[in-house]
Amino acid sequence: KLLQVSTIAMQQQEKLIQQERALLNFTEWKRSCALQMKYCQAFMQNSLSSAHNSSPCPNNWIQNRESCYYVSEIWSIWHTSQENCLKEGSTLLQIESKEEMDFITGSLRKIKGSYDYWVGLSQDGHSGRWLWQDGSSPSPGLLPAERSQSANQVCGYVKSNSLLSSNCSTWKYFICEKYALRSSV
């Protein structure tokens, strides 16, 4: 009788673990879908506004290769910074290479001083992995230098020529990025 009860208990526990896994997968899938939708909206908005504009980047944006960057002069927490970018048909900056990082830090040196700027990097709560907003992982050379001691959600920011991490609810400037228009020659 006791053996039967413990077998049932183990089966129930196994079922619970499977359900938790399924829920976790669903949550990740939902997050991924929501992000893809935001990116589609941003892309469409960008394409539509581009149709009325012949220069590769909008006013007050800086161009480097295929990208346009906007260095904000307003402060927001990370999530609001992302929202501000999305409404412009862009996203928080995603740094793909050392060359791009050098361009950004060089531009910041010229524009301002040593301030903090949110980028589109955040730490996954479950795995602790760093992820860009499109769900990809940063290359090993582009991981935040210091691990934040915060118990809250942690996000990435650029300061001088470093990529650092901080509580996502702190106030910082931010950098938006979108595709530059290809001029039809």
Epitope: Y70, I74, I77, H79, T80, E83, N84, C85, K87, E88
Partner: nanobody
Framework: QVQLQESGGGLVQAGGSLRLSCAAS????????VAWFRQAPGKQRELVAA????????SYANSAKGRFVLSRDNAKNTVYLQMDSLKPEDTAVYYC?????????????WGQGTQVTVSS
Amino acid sequence: QVQLQESGGGLVQAGGSLRLSCAASGRTLSNYAVAWFRQAPGKQRELVAAIWWASGGISYANSAKGRFVLSRDNAKNTVYLQMDSLKPEDTAVYYCAAASSVLSGTADYWGQGTQVTVSS
């Protein structure tokens, strides 16, 4: 259409406080940020602070950070700008606006503006 009505401006001494109100009516604000801009004589209009109506996400300009606080009352469709430690350079006409973008410095709908004068 969105109608915006500002109130709360006036004359105040340096170091004093004012609370501006912006009452919105008409169509839904869910796709907009309600923003406060200001324009001093002979200067360009500049963003002071903004709140995305749907998410409640707030942004502040450098000039406002640490001295001004933006809040809203959903039930009253009203946004408030609490301005403390006012300086003579805060003297301007303050406009409430509904904007679909915070970064562009432009807005879809504007209020009439309310004068804030800070004397030294």
